[in-house]
Amino acid sequence: AWELTILHTNDVHSRLEQTSEDSSKCVNASRCMGGVARLFTKVQQIRRAEPNVLLLDAGDQYQGTIWFTVYKGAEVAHFMNALRYDAMALGNHEFDNGVEGLIEPLLKEAKFPILSANIKAKGPLASQISGLYLPYKVLPVGDEVVGIVGYTSKETPFLSNPGTNLVFEDEITALQPEVDKLKTLNVNKIIALGHSGFEMDKLIAQKVRGVDVVVGGHSNTFLYTGNPPSKEVPAGKYPFIVTSDDGRKVPVVQAYAFGKYLGYLKIEFDERGNVISSHGNPILLNSSIPEDPSIKADINKWRIKLDNYSTQELGKTIVYLDGSSQSCRFRECNMGNLICDAMINNNLRHTDEMFWNHVSMCILNGGGIRSPIDERNNGTITWENLAAVLPFGGTFDLVQLKGSTLKKAFEHSVHRYGQSTGEFLQVGGIHVVYDLSRKPGDRVVKLDVLCTKCRVPSYDPLKMDEVYKVILPNFLANGGDGFQMIKDELLRHDSGDQDINVVSTYISKMKVIYPAVEGRIKFSTGSH
């Protein structure tokens, strides 16, 4: 028998520095978690203690904090190289800055293989990107070899900016021939490493012949055997065992997100490469694990540029950006309109000739807007200004909801109107009319939404049974501000980009902004 230790991370999302328990900015260092310096300490400890160790990442290192905004992926390559990762799979967010934003900072700089078997380059890109990412890689581990085959969510063209010269194939269809190839190369221990979410991970384990272990990402799934060490609630045991169609027991793992845990899986193989046993658990990277001093010093060196960036001008406003609670929690406010417009703009993806865009709607809880921006300061808008508007470090996510769920959400928006509560919705691509003289739960008298399957966008009445795509804060997707119906009824949820980054990118792109209050939210006569 031969034992392999798989250490794995996924969905780190730019958390290079330690964070608070909820993965936001670290406030009280004695209670902070994660970060690459602490991760390195634990990885080195395990490498010293155990003979056959692989350190793998299942994608979405990109996007999530100012680190990515400023360094654009160079920080990922640098610190992953420093930690001596053995392989990484491409996630959807690796394409957020286009293919160039993946090739230059990461693919060309990484000293470890970056993998995806279901992404195929075509046209002029094919030769440019050739060899920079691979479908699979055979890694020597001790006296043995292990094959790692990569995969990426086929939804990436809807979630990021991979351009038109990359084709995202079905994961299972693309993986099988690559696994077969590895088998012909006499590689009998094969790990599928990828970024398509837990449901697809389980399907791969079930359907792809020859895959021994699946290490996944994208769905931020927390698995744990026994008593969990922090506030994450396990979606199942670690490892999650799937019985494959050919009768094998295939362990599937994921390690939540944000570098809070290091996945730790021990696999025992027999001489024919069959999995005899698998066990382990994610390791909580809390303050009992010291931060490695040399990596920490490097982090501090790289940090300097971030502090300078915060005060640089991103663009200008020639109007007052009203982010006051008096406005945004009671009526349409132009700060809400600006943020929603930025959210839609960030999700422009022309992937189908029938659609001008795949999503046209945005909702945003007014309570999430926490500051105005005064145009009389020379009109200057900085990252620092935006951090005051959006201080909670969330993401703007893509969900799919039925029209009936959206109607419930808008009823909830005004169910206790007038108390300065945060659930009052700011919108984009939506026209809503409320009648506050009616009883709570029956106050939405008109709800029109911007069409997507059209060449000239126009507003049509919401259809209760239709499925709509909506951009919204992760806070709402998780049921925050009482929006339980969104959490309970959403049909799909893909995590998006850092909120401040979305707005800052939009302002930089527009250069000068002048959002108006333009009748997106109205109150019918006699009720307001």
Epitope: S324, S325, R329, R370, P372, P391, S420, G482, Q484
Partner: antibody, heavy 116, light 105 residues
Framework: VQLVESGGGLVQPGGSLRLSCAAS????????MHWVRQAPGKGLEWVAV????????YYADSVKGRFTISRDNSKNTLYLQMNSLRAEDTAVYYC??????????WGQGTLVTVSS | IQMTQSPSSLSASVGDRVTITCRAS??????LAWYQQKPGKAPKLLIY???TLQSGVPSRFSGSGSGTDFTLTISSLQPEDFATYYC????????FGQGTRLEIK
């Protein structure tokens, strides 16, 4: 995150007192702020709230018209001006951020005693 | 909106499973929080939005309910859990329950 209340003490019925709450370790101007009180040996009673930018204020019926909540975001400080004090206002007064939400932090309290 | 907690006091032993209930005088959706308070200390938030565990709070604490009836459960009492517990609604201007004193049997 730290919230430090001050300004409590002994005051006669009908008198006035101004409580302060100095905040540090977080972006004070981003948070709604509350005052909550607790009479000796009794339960918690919510007193007042002010939105992050000062544009919305709400009060418990028991203090309406007598107490005024205010804030100075440039000084990271929350205030409670208490007028026409009564014996039943005797309590430990706590300031707190966004109660009943993720960003919920409380100070250690300051004691106000209304007695002749 | 009035909040009624029961029981007002409760004796239990380390390792016990304990349940405290809270009833609102009208529907409050999931706008309910649970606090723990020890003598001479400020209250500490345990649960918000009826069932969401606050960061740093042990997983033995859990909350459930929606509308008018809510429950705080401590799955296995630890010595440090003996304290007074309050529910609080934030559907309208905040209002606390009268408290439940949990003491050692």
């Amino acid at each position: 995150v730290q919230l430090v209340e001050s300004g409590g003490g002994l005051v006669q019925p009908g008198g006035s007192l101004r409580l302060s709450c100095a905040a540090s370790g977080f972006t004070f101007s981003s948070y709604d702020m509350h005052w909550v009180r607790q009479a000796p040996g009794k339960g918690l009673e919510w007193v007042a709230v002010m939105s992050y930018d000062g544009s919305n204020k709400y009060y418990a019926d028991s203090v309406k018209g007598r107490f005024t909540i205010s804030r100075d975001n440039s000084k990271n400080t929350l205030y409670l001006q208490m007028n026409s004090l009564r014996a039943e206002d005797t309590a430990v007064y706590y300031c707190a951020t966004e109660i009943a939400a993720k960003g919920d932090y409380w100070g250690q309290g300051t004691l106000v005693t209304v007695s002749s | 909106i009035q909040m009624t907690q029961s029981p007002s006091s409760l004796s239990a032993s380390v390792g016990d499973r304990v349940t405290i209930t809270c009833r609102a005088s009208q529907g409050i959706s999931n706008y309910l929080a649970w606090y723990q308070q020890k003598p001479g200390k400020a209250p500490k938030l345990l649960i918000y939005a009826a069932s969401t565990l606050q960061s740093g709070v042990p997983s033995r604490f859990s909350g459930s309910g929606s509308g008018t009836d809510f429950t705080l459960t401590i799955s296995s009492l630890q010595p440090e859990d003996f304290a007074t517990y309050y529910c609080q609604q934030s559907y309208s201007t905040p209002h606390f329950g009268q408290g439940t004193r949990l003491e050692i049997k």
